[in-house]
Interface confidence: low
């Protein structure tokens, strides 16, 4: 349905509040270094322009595309060249190349200061003084640090952020009320950002077909009673939504996501019995709820898959007639029967099935050739099952912190060229799989663990892509989306790595460590552990454990000392010397 003015169409569909919020997110995700005030000014100008188009769709420039309007606006920023360097060259291009250029300059790890949380009273005062500015600032700060954050979902987070302040700033104990809510929003926000980053990487690096395959598998697990054609329709619509958001088309994305939620709720009888509660909620909550809804029960009497996909004499005919449709049906039928499998495993099985048909349908006796295809699935299923079993046992034995340390050592030995902050961040997140997934029963462990690991390893891939330092990381990240985790799991110690020169400064600590939160203190220790492994990649677990135990004792001792700084200086030297001796540095 063509509209004379796209900007007027979206303004009317979304309403002024959501329109302004989404334009702010879009601008902050593109120009991540721009001050808040500059963005607010640009958003206000765009909003005023949109209102003129709503009043008269034939008014000057109202017929321009959103990319043209937004790009023109971004290119009016005076300090573009000084602040963003070569990104300013994007402004010399025409649409659609200009937007593509802006997208390529999105920075997953922007050089921005860490967000420090002010005192609760300070935040509550700011909230009461100017609620609108306070909430806009939240959108801006999250969007510029997470340039691929799912925009309509960020509106949902902002709604919860506002609700937390509204409730807690009038509570008797403001801090007790507010801080746990903010911690929860922060943790959920990081997880949401990482999940969306994988969707965008899937679309941008591996194409629409890869994303659609992921979506068929996931939606078939979630809606096993829905028809294949119904699932296909949802996949098509969902792909459009995510393509738009990942492409910076946030107004279209939010609008289409709302339409999709509406469709799902109007057709829930033929989709899932689990949607009722979600569909009674307001729009933002509804969309979030649908995205997180539990899997529906599997139909009781599903026939064997072998009949249609192995035993039928028409397998090759059906495959040849419509390859992607037939493979889609295979993936749908397999996924709806296996909520206990990870999506990436289901995609590996579908790939194996496709490869077998490609080979066998050209053979003299196709049926004889593909008759045992399901036998090839067994090792693919057992590999993640065994890996999860072993790692959950290790997690239960060690606890989260020490399990993270085991992974830090494992991954530093695999890819020692990767920067220490990245190794610490990624290994800490990999380690969280234990507390997130190992508590689940067997039937839920694999989808929880392996699909979570896909999200975390994608963080490694996007951070590494910015400054590539390891061919092994590049290989695992680019060869196959669904085999990233097995690829990293299969990596052994990098024998080509030349150990890092020893630098005492890396292992010099000060009294400020004593005032850090437990989490920050862990990160300091884990940073030291990575550096140790980089200096001595052949160090044994026992050697590293001994050094880390000494280090923990040293920190504890000096933090209890009267003269902390002197203790850190003197005892630190002894610790470095003892560690060097222990590791033979």
């Amino acid at each position: 349905d063509a509209h004379k003015s796209e900007v007027a169409h979206r303004f009317k569909d979304l309403g002024e509040e959501n329109f302004k919020a989404l334009v702010l997110i879009a601008f902050a995700q593109y120009l991540q270094q721009c001050p808040f005030e500059d963005h607010v000014k640009l958003v206000n100008e765009v909003t005023e322009f949109a209102k003129t188009c709503v009043a008269d769709e034939s008014a000057e420039n109202c017929d321009k595309s959103l990319h043209t309007l937004f790009g023109d606006k971004l290119c009016t920023v005076a300090t573009l060249r000084e602040t963003y360097g070569e990104m300013a060259d994007c402004c010399a291009k025409q649409e659609p190349e200009r937007n593509e250029c802006f997208l390529q300059h999105k920075d997953d790890n922007p050089n921005l200061p860490r967000l420090v949380r002010p005192e609760v009273d300070v935040m509550c005062t700011a909230f009461h003084d100017n609620e609108e500015t306070f909430l806009k600032k939240y959108l801006y700060e999250i969007a510029r640090r997470h340039p691929y954050f799912y925009a309509p979902e960020l509106l949902f987070f902002a709604k919860r952020y506002k609700a937390a302040f509204t409730e807690c700033c009038q509570a008797a104990d403001k801090a007790a009320c507010l801080l746990p809510k903010l911690d929860e929003l922060r943790d959920e926000g990081k997880a949401s950002s990482a999940k969306q980053r994988l969707k965008c990487a899937s679309l941008q690096k591996f194409g629409e077909r890869a994303f659609k395959a992921w979506a068929v598998a996931r939606l078939s697990q979630r809606f096993p009673k829905a028809e294949f054609a119904e699932v296909s329709k949802l996949v098509t619509d969902l792909t459009k939504v995510h393509t738009e958001c990942c492409h910076g088309d946030l107004l279209e994305c939010a609008d289409d996501r709302a339409d999709l939620a509406k469709y799902i709720c109007e057709n829930q009888d033929s989709i899932s019995s689990k949607l009722k509660e979600c569909c009674e909620k307001p729009l933002l909550e509804k969309s979030h709820c649908i995205a997180e809804v539990e899997n529906d029960e599997m139909p009781a009497d599903l026939p064997s898959l072998a009949a249609d996909f192995v035993e039928s004499k028409d397998v090759c005919k059906n495959y040849a007639e419509a390859k992607d449709v037939f493979l889609g049906m295979f993936l749908y039928e397999y996924a709806r029967r296996h909520p206990d499998y990870s999506v990436v495993l289901l995609l590996r099985l579908a790939k194996t099935y496709e490869t077998t048909l490609e080979k066998c349908c050209a053979a003299a006796d196709p049926h004889e050739c593909y008759a045992k295809v399901f036998d090839e699935f067994k090792p693919l299923v057992e590999e993640p099952q065994n890996l999860i079993k072993q790692n959950c046992e290790l997690f239960e034995q060690l606890g989260e912190y020490k399990f993270q340390n085991a992974l830090l050592v494992r991954y530093t030995k695999k890819v020692p060229q990767v920067s220490t902050p990245t190794l610490v961040e990624v290994s800490r997140n990999l380690g969280k799989v234990g507390s997130k997934c190992c508590k689940h029963p067997e039937a839920k462990r694999m989808p929880c663990a392996e699909d979570y690991l896909s999200v975390v390893l994608n963080q490694l891939c996007v951070l590494h892509e910015k400054t590539p330092v390891s061919d092994r990381v590049t290989k695992c990240c680019t060869e196959s989306l669904v085999n990233r985790r097995p690829c990293f799991s299969a990596l052994e110690v990098d024998e080509t790595y030349v150990p890092k020169e020893f630098n005492a400064e890396t292992f010099t600590f000060h009294a400020d460590i004593c005032t850090l939160s437990e989490k920050e203190r862990q990160i300091k220790k884990q940073t030291a552990l990575v550096e140790l492994v980089k200096h001595k990649p052949k160090a044994t677990k026992e050697q590293l454990k001994a050094v880390m135990d000494d280090f923990a004792a040293f920190v504890e001792k000096c933090c209890k000392a009267d003269d902390k700084e002197t203790c850190f200086a003197e005892e630190g030297k002894k610790l470095v010397a003892a560690s060097q001796a222990a590791l033979g540095l």
Partner: nanobody, 115 residues
Framework: QVQLQESGGGLVQPGGSLRLSCAAS????????MSWVRQAPGKGPEWVSA????????RYAESVKGRFTISRDNAKSTLYLQMNSLKPEDTAVYYC????????GSQGTQVTVSS
């Protein structure tokens, strides 16, 4: 939007015949295998019969073999089920579905076999 509309049901005496039709729209009918599923009062859905996309390969549940015939007309995007020698135990709501599936995405048509 995917739509499946069944028709042709009704009340019939034991030993009688009915022909059910299912008009499909909103997807490429000729690319998909199709099935008939039925649900008797108070029971779960039961798969009845399936046909591949081209119409060459047909399958039947043991309970209907030799009495029911599934067919399709891809030009008309319509699926059929010819039901002969009907028995009281065939009484159910009949649904057409995409793929070999026992899930229901449509309204169905009531078939009652009674004297």
């Amino acid at each position: 939007q995917v739509q499946l509309q069944e028709s042709g049901g009704g009340l019939v005496q034991p030993g009688g015949s009915l022909r059910l039709s299912c008009a499909a729209s909103g997807f490429t009918f000729g690319s998909f295998g199709m099935s008939w599923v039925r649900q008797a009062p108070g029971k779960g859905p039961e798969w009845v019969s399936a046909i591949d996309s081209g119409g060459a390969d047909t399958r039947y549940a043991e309970s209907v073999k030799g009495r029911f015939t599934i067919s399709r007309d891809n030009a008309k995007s319509t699926l059929y089920l010819q039901m002969n020698s009907l028995k009281p135990e065939d009484t159910a709501v009949y649904y057409c579905t995409i793929g070999r599936s026992s899930s229901r995405g449509s309204q169905g048509t009531q078939v009652t076999v009674s004297s």
